[in-house]
Amino acid sequence: QDCSAQCQCAAEAAPHCPAGVSLVLDGCGCCRVCAKQLGELCTERDPCDPHKGLFCDFGSPANRKIGVCTAKDGAPCVFGGSVYRSGESFQSSCKYQCTCLDGAVGCVPLCSMDVRLPSPDCPFPRRVKLPGKCCEEWVCDEPKDRTAVGPALAAYRLEDTFGPDPTMMRANCLVQTTEWSACSKTCGMGISTRVTNDNTFCRLEKQSRLCMVRPCEADLEENIKKGKKCIRTPKIAKPVKFELSGCTSVKTYRAKFCGVCTDGRCCTPHRTTTLPVEFKCPDGEIMKKNMMFIKTCACHYNCPGDNDIFESLYYRKMYGDMA
């Protein structure tokens, strides 16, 4: 695609995209456009929605002109008795537009959660559900005595004016965050992910953090006391430095790890927190990565089978994360 020509956008102002559709830069980095959705035609100039894990599938390498927006492989979602593909958008009700992203559903309200402040034209604004309308609408009760607008105003109820508490919501965003997934490795450095729209633009995004349930080299079964079947949180004798792709953590950490059992149970993180860890690489580069730190572990029989695609929910989810 030729981006050498001067940028020319269809309109000076950014387009107004429908609910749940991202506003993105075109392939030339010139103009802001509404991202194409799952199954729609796309070009390098009209990109697919990256916040839904979509990419423009051009089919054969020779064809770089027109493609179809396709979802990167991700887990489907079950919502309200229906199955949705990762990247697929759907309306869960007249009030919400939802998107499936790798097994998690995030929704944005289609109804305005706008606040109305009192004015001479509408001294006592209230939100009410009108017959035949999906969304609540503002109505303006006229003051009983027009001459008493001033003194009467002091007596209106705050919640009548505001509707929902504005501190509880980002404007027009139903904030949702999934639990952290289980660590991708049962020993050594792995990845744990979650999906959230807790960001400035209420966009679904996948967040990841490093995780280590236990070091691979530790022979934890040796430490199980006689008569006991499990060691839930073994004591690690010395502080450790984490390693990632040849880079080493700048600080040492006295981290907690989960132990093992001899009776078929497995021990997994139960309460965790997320903290940034700086890694120094051989070339001197410093990179900062979020990492899971274990607070407590739990030993249970809900262990994932090697081929079990419906891994136990208990195992897949990380409870009580503070971040």
């Epitope: 305005s112 606040v115 009192p118 609408e137 607008v149 105003l153």
Partner: antibody, heavy 114, light 110 residues
Framework: EVQLQESGPGLVKPSQTLSLTCTVS????????VHWIRQHPGKGLEWLGV???????DYNAAFMSRLTISKDTSKNQVSFKLSSVTAADTAVYYC????????WGQGTTVTVSS | ETVVTQEPSLTVSPGGTVTLTCRSS?????????ANWVQQKPGQAFRGLIG???NRAPWTPARFSGSLLGGKAALTLSGVQPEDEAEYYC?????????FGGGTKLTVLG
């Protein structure tokens, strides 16, 4: 998402009529009124007039004789017409939503010059 | 002609408290003046902070509060943040029209 966008010619000749449009999205102009305000370069704000949700209007007395504000609810647009303009009308013109003047347009610069 | 007067400029240190006022030339400001406070940060659009004397817009932090104080409309900022540095305008309603104040330039030191 609530948005207001002013549009119109950037240059108007003296004695002509200045016509601006405020295009609204994210709310209905039959539910909220729309105000017009202007700001001279390096100066404060000056309220010009308002069209209320039910279509009634109120104007700054100083502009009463030459200002008309109207609306097209089907297009969710408010129009602003200021006649017999002079160089003193050179300013940035804004539309804003009623109710605490909570949302404003980015403004449109109007220069009156021959 | 009704005139609405604001302090031209005020300076405050981060974490401090400052009160901006809005005086009417024709008497005490009351709730029927529907005092509004509008903010403009450098390079940004105007946005309303307070409407109807004391009601915060959804984006207005709790450290901003609107009230009537000694016959004037007042905007009080408690625990001032560097990002509060801006121009603040008040607007008062007089039965048939609004009048804007001249604006207050708030500078946050440091």
């Amino acid at each position: 998402e609530v948005q207001l966008q002013e549009s119109g010619p950037g240059l108007v000749k003296p004695s002509q009529t200045l016509s601006l449009t405020c295009t609204v999205s994210g709310f209905s102009i039959s539910t909220f009124g729309v105000h017009w305000i202007r700001q001279h370069p390096g100066k404060g704000l000056e309220w010009l007039g308002v069209i209320w949700r039910r279509g009634g209007t109120d104007y700054n007395a100083a502009f009463m004789s030459r200002l008309t504000i109207s609306k097209d609810t089907s297009k969710n647009q408010v129009s602003f017409k200021l006649s017999s303009v002079t160089a003193a009308d050179t300013a940035v013109y804004y539309c804003a939503r009623d109710g605490g003047f909570d949302y404003w347009g980015q403004g449109t610069t109007v220069t009156v010059s021959s | 002609e009704t005139v609405v007067t604001q302090e031209p400029s005020l300076t405050v240190s981060p974490g401090g408290t400052v009160t901006l006022t809005c005086r009417s030339s024709i008497g005490a400001v009351t709730t029927s003046n529907y005092a509004n406070w509008v903010q403009q940060k450098p390079g940004q659009a105007f946005r309303g902070l307070i409407g109807g004397t004391s009601n915060r817009a959804p984006w207005t932090p709790a450290r901003f509060s609107g009230s009537l104080l000694g016959g004037k409309a007042a905007l009080t900022l408690s625990g001032v943040q560097p990002e509060d540095e801006a121009e603040y305008y008040c607007a008062l309603w007089y039965s048939t029209h609004y009048v804007f104040g001249g604006g207050t330039k708030l500078t946050v030191l440091g």
